[in-house]
Structure formats: structure tokens, C-alpha cells
Interface confidence: low
Amino acid sequence: QPSVSPGENTKPEILTYDRLVNGMLQCVAAGFPEPTIDWYFCPGTEQRCSASVLPVDVQTLNSSGPPFGKLVVQSSIDSSAFKHNGTVECKAYNDVGKTSAYFNFAFKEQIHPHHHHHH
């Protein structure tokens, strides 16, 4: 049963945000119209992110199942580019609104996502 009729505008929701085994940070968002995913780096503990990060790979996924009526976009960045502690923001937005997810980033340590979003 579709939760959203095709063409109904919906604010992006971030479906997954993960650190992959190859060191990539990946963010997957769904919404209508198709969300844009932008990446930002915030030095230190500040969550005011201004330095834009160029994604290494972006694709629109074919979604035959949930979330119905939404377009799903996957974007990845290469974490090896970061040399300082800080936070990485994945921001998904479209004409309706925006949603962000954050990764804590510690140089030469593991990256783990915050388990909260900013809307």
C-alpha cells in the first residue's frame, strides 16, 4: 500500500548514513521532488558546517518498493580527505525542505554517525 501518492511533494528523509568498509561515507535520502545531497565539514565540535565537500559518487536509485512515490538518492564522499577532527554533515534538501545527519570524525579513529537529525 503506497504511503505517498506519486507526485506528492515530500520533505527528504535520510534513510541511511553509514561509514562503509572501504572508508567511504554514504548517505541515502528519499523525497519528492528528487533530493539533492550536499556534504559539509565542520571543524572541531562546531555543528555550523560551511566547508563544502565534493562527493565522489552520486546516483538516483530505482525504488520499486518503499518508500513509495519518492525518489531515492545515494551520495558518497571519501573520508580519507579529512585530516582533522570534526563533524561531517550530510544535508538532503528539495523544494519542500531539508534534513541533515551528522558523522563524528576523529582523525585516525573510527567515524560513527550521530543518531539524530536536524530538520
Epitope: 572501504n22 565534493l54 565522489v56
Partner: antibody, heavy 117, light 110 residues
Framework: EVQLLESGGGLVQPGGSLRLSCAAS????????MQWVRQAPGKGLEWVSS????????QYADSVKGRFTISRDNSKNTLYLQMNSLRAEDTAVYYC??????????WGQGTMVTVSS | DIQMTQSPGTLSLSPGERATLSCRAS???????LAWYQQKPGQAPRLLIY???TRATGIPDRFSGSGSGTDFTLTISRLEPEDFAVYYC???????????FGQGTKLEIK
Amino acid sequence: EVQLLESGGGLVQPGGSLRLSCAASGFTFSNYQMQWVRQAPGKGLEWVSSIRPSGGSTQYADSVKGRFTISRDNSKNTLYLQMNSLRAEDTAVYYCARGSSHAFDIWGQGTMVTVSS
Amino acid sequence: DIQMTQSPGTLSLSPGERATLSCRASQSFRSSYLAWYQQKPGQAPRLLIYDTSTRATGIPDRFSGSGSGTDFTLTISRLEPEDFAVYYCQQYGSSPPMYTFGQGTKLEIK
């Protein structure tokens, strides 16, 4: 140092074939979308083809669709462009470039392909 | 398909002057996917700006990008001798996936 180095260009007759290679170094090749872009003598840039990091999805400009095939070998850090049924209008410098849909951030120096009888 | 038109075709200016290069799309698109490149004779293109206004790594702050919808601008605030080159804008369209370059603007010394 991040680097892309094209090879395989040369002179070929119309209807002939050529295979271009692009050797990547200094970055994790298998993580990146890659593309071929060409530039005819004295003309502007024209996107030719793109391939996703895994190689599972490819895109082509209409002008080369059905004649050119992009591929990659992530174990060799190498990108390829197989060009068949070549035409005079395919004469150009062919660049490989790294990047995503946002932009192409690293380019090779190019390899010249001349199609002439 | 979206067409990208750059103007002027040639721009003649002197070092120290301000350069304004225009790129117009035949239809509106997502501004995240507008980039600018610089190309000098015999060299490969170099990425200057992506996402309409973000400078690529190592690009001096005299280069700036702006715009939205169909009209985009590359501005070089104070021309240096090494800035004289050809500049291309580039757009990405996702349906079908393809990349479109403008025809280029040649920035030459007056």
C-alpha cells in the same frame, strides 16, 4: 599525487576501432565514478561516457551510443574506452576525468585520436 | 536536453580588471550541478567552481560563482596574467544522465 594518464590514441581509418586506457594513481580508484570527455581540434568540450564505481552502470552521449563502450578494471586501477565504427567526427583529444555528477575534479592530459583515410 | 549557452564568446580585458562570464541554460535545473572549468592552450581543463559557487581545492578567492535557475555567472574579481584562458560551464542532468558543456568563453588580454 593524484594522477590520470591516458594512452592508446593514434591514427585510424574510418570504420576502424581503437581502445583507449586511463591509468589512475594516488587515490582509491574503485570508489570513484569516472568519465571520458573529448575535444575536437579548436572546439569545445564534449562529454562522451561515464561509469559508476563498481562498473555496473554506464551512460553515453547520443553521438557515441552503440559504437563506444566504457569499462573499468578496479584491480588494475584502469579505465577503458573501446571505440568501434569510428568516424571522422570522432577525431579529438580524449580525456579521462574523475568525479561525480557535481563536477569532474581531476583530469588526465589527454590522448589524441585521429580518424582519417 | 538542456543546452548551455555562454556569453560573450570572447572577452577582451586587461590585467587588474574584473571579468564577468555568463552561462545560460535552456531550462531551469538544480543549481547543485553547475560547474566551471578553466582551460589553457595545450592543457587539460581544470575545475574551478562546483555546486554553482563552491571553489575547488587550491582555487584563488578572486574566482567566484553565482546564479540559479537558468542564469549563472563566473566572476574573476581582479584579473591576473595567468587567468587568460578559455572558460567552460557544465551542467548535469539526471533524466537521462548526461553532462552538457557550454561552448566556452575565451578571455583574452586587451
